[in-house]
């Protein structure tokens, strides 16, 4: 690469090798060749010889000028035309970069996916910088004032074992590159409030022998607190609209929900819960498909060993319809 060139002279860039995109840039080349009084000095950008805006400053030095340089990266080198030599002689080279100072990181969120053992923090980095930008996540205990730092790119996983300073923390991220530095707003987190519970599992469904098919959905959740609030959504796979059943439930009971459904129809069910006084919902459980019988007979569905793929559902089923969280919608 350019960095390994053995220079016979010097190359420098104004305003610098890393500069703000859109700036005017001058690249200088100064030769220090033995046994050569160059007729001409030539500049190459990414392997192509430059034809315009080249100025010979003196016998040893030349400059190429770029108006509004907007390439994120370019490799520059310069050569000399030495009398009596057939080939041009390499003088020096430089990698140059243009980009932007970082925006202040925004929309920082930290969650603990249940049983993951990590606090995962993400943020919006803002507009692309085009140059190497480092993000440092600062975590400060509100109880002990102890501060820890974690180097990141656009998210960070912090082991909860390393968070020994109690349950409350201030978290912020600092973005730094060659052109500037910005801090996000500080986020106050309580480790107990940011847990995203693992999803519930629908274990089976049965439709009882009846004129109007009654389907019982059996499911379980790892939320072990006494009372939780849950939603079960269901729809015929031929329909666009989810129906949502809401209920408070107590985990001392077998979890079951009853539905009167249309006969000879394929339905998809999903459930999610939220612990009492907790902010975060579980993600929707994996889709569970159950076919109601055509005639009055009993049908039982169990989830297959492979995750269920519902080919007949497409993203269009959500058009014009909102639920509080469609992040796990089937699409």
């Amino acid at each position: 690469g350019i960095a390994t060139i053995n220079c016979s002279g010097n190359m420098w860039v104004e305003p610098g090798e890393i500069f703000q995109m859109g700036m005017n840039v001058s690249v200088y080349c100064q030769e220090a060749l033995k046994n050569c009084r160059p007729r001409n000095l030539h500049f190459y950008k990414n392997g192509f010889k430059e034809r315009f805006h080249i100025t010979r400053i003196n016998r040893t030095t030349a400059r190429v000028w770029y108006k509004g340089f907007s390439e994120p990266h370019a490799s520059m080198y310069c050569t000399a035309e030495c009398p009596g030599r057939f080939q041009e002689t390499l003088i020096c080279g430089k990698d140059i970069s243009s980009g932007y100072p970082p925006d202040a990181p925004s929309n920082m969120t930290c969650v603990i996916y249940e049983y993951s053992g990590n606090m995962t923090c993400t943020w919006n980095t803002g507009k692309p910088t085009y140059i190497d930008t480092k993000y440092t996540v600062h975590v400060k205990s509100l109880e002990t004032e102890e501060q820890q730092q974690y180097l990141a790119s656009n998210y960070v996983n912090i082991s909860t074992d390393s968070l020994q300073g109690g349950r409350k923390y201030l978290v912020w991220v600092q973005a730094v590159n060659a052109l500037g530095m910005e801090n996000s707003q500080q986020l106050q987190v309580h480790l107990d409030d940011i847990v995203i519970p693992s999803p519930s599992i629908i274990s089976r469904a049965e439709t009882t022998n009846a004129n109007v098919p009654k389907t019982i959905i059996y499911w379980k959740s790892k939320i072990m607190t006494g009372k939780v609030f849950c939603e079960m959504r269901y729809k015929a796979t031929t329909n666009q609209t989810w129906n949502v059943k809401e209920f408070d439930t107590n985990y001392t009971y077998v979890q079951q929900s009853e539905f009167y459904l249309e006969p000879n129809s394929k339905y998809v069910f999903q459930v999610r819960c939220q612990g009492t006084g907790k902010r975060n919902w579980q993600p929707w459980s994996s889709p569970f498909v159950h076919q109601t019988p055509q005639t009055a007979s009993q049908v039982t569905s169990k989830p297959p060993h492979e995750p269920q793929k519902i080919e007949m559902l497409t993203a269009t089923i959500f058009k014009g319809h909102s639920t509080s969280d469609n992040s796990q919608d089937i699409g």
Epitope: N239, N243, N250, E258, Y260, E262
Partner: antibody, heavy 117, light 107 residues
Framework: EVKLVESGGGLVQPGGSLKLSCAAS????????MSWVRQTPEKRLELVAE????????YHIDTVKGRFTISRDNAKNTLYLQMSSLKSEDTAMYYC??????????WGQGTTVTVSA | DIVMTQSHRFMSTSVGERVSITCKAS??????VAWYQQKPGQSPKLLIY???TRHNGVPDRFTGSGSGTDFTLTISNVQGEDLADYFC?????????FGSGTKLEIK
């Protein structure tokens, strides 16, 4: 034949309590969700509360949460609605209905609750 | 909450006529709609569920139709005993909500 018979209604002062009961027969009570639906003097119908077949899951509308509690005794084929901190807007005919979700195929004859000073 | 609007508080018809009672949901409820009949002094009775399925013993002169936000209960060949209040109900979202009712009067 499905039969639902409500009882326990009456006249009560604001802030008072009542417990409604619904005796069920003619179907397998223990395998169906059950509900209480009320009808205001202006004839507006409103689902008040719902309970799953095993009693493990319940639903109460926001306006009665913390004041009303639905429960059931499957051994006695009976549905209950414990009402406390009653308000004048709770005045209505209270019906026991089965199944309690998603529609109401069978209704009792109703019991009247009047909240008035 | 989903509001179910029955724009006609009263409707008047004659025996043998056909009448359509309409109900409009404030948002898409798919086909999760039921219809009830309440005769004077009685409890409501289920007529239709899943928009168009008749409940056991309901005469076939009662038919339901619609989807999304607009629903209709049609009574063809109206009989004297059809004098009643008719209510729609959605069960797509909690709280389950009812229309305010349409009173059918027989001329």
């Amino acid at each position: 034949e499905v039969k639902l018979v409500e009882s326990g209604g009456g006249l009560v002062q604001p802030g008072g309590s009542l417990k409604l009961s619904c005796a069920a027969s003619g179907f397998t009570f223990s395998s169906d969700t059950m509900s209480w639906v009320r009808q205001t003097p202006e004839k507006r119908l409103e689902l008040v509360a719902e309970i799953s077949s095993n009693g493990g899951s319940t639903y109460h509308i926001d306006t009665v949460k913390g004041r009303f509690t639905i429960s059931r005794d499957n051994a006695k084929n009976t549905l209950y609605l414990q009402m406390s901190s009653l308000k004048s807007e709770d005045t209505a005919m209270y019906y026991c209905a089965s199944p309690g979700y998603p529609w109401f195929a069978y209704w009792g004859q109703g019991t009247t609750v009047t909240v008035s000073a | 909450d989903i509001v179910m609007t029955q724009s006609h508080r009263f409707m008047s018809t004659s025996v043998g006529e056909r009448v359509s009672i309409t109900c409009k949901a404030s948002q898409d409820v798919g086909n999760a709609v039921a219809w009830y009949q309440q005769k004077p002094g009685q409890s409501p009775k289920l007529l239709i569920y899943w928009t168009s399925t008749r409940h056991n013993g309901v005469p076939d002169r009662f038919t339901g139709s619609g989807s999304g936000t607009d629903f209709t209960l049609t009574i063809s060949n109206v009989q004297g005993e059809d004098l009643a209040d008719y209510f729609c109900q959605q069960y797509n979202r909690y709280p389950l909500t009812f229309g305010s009712g349409t009173k059918l009067e027989i001329k």
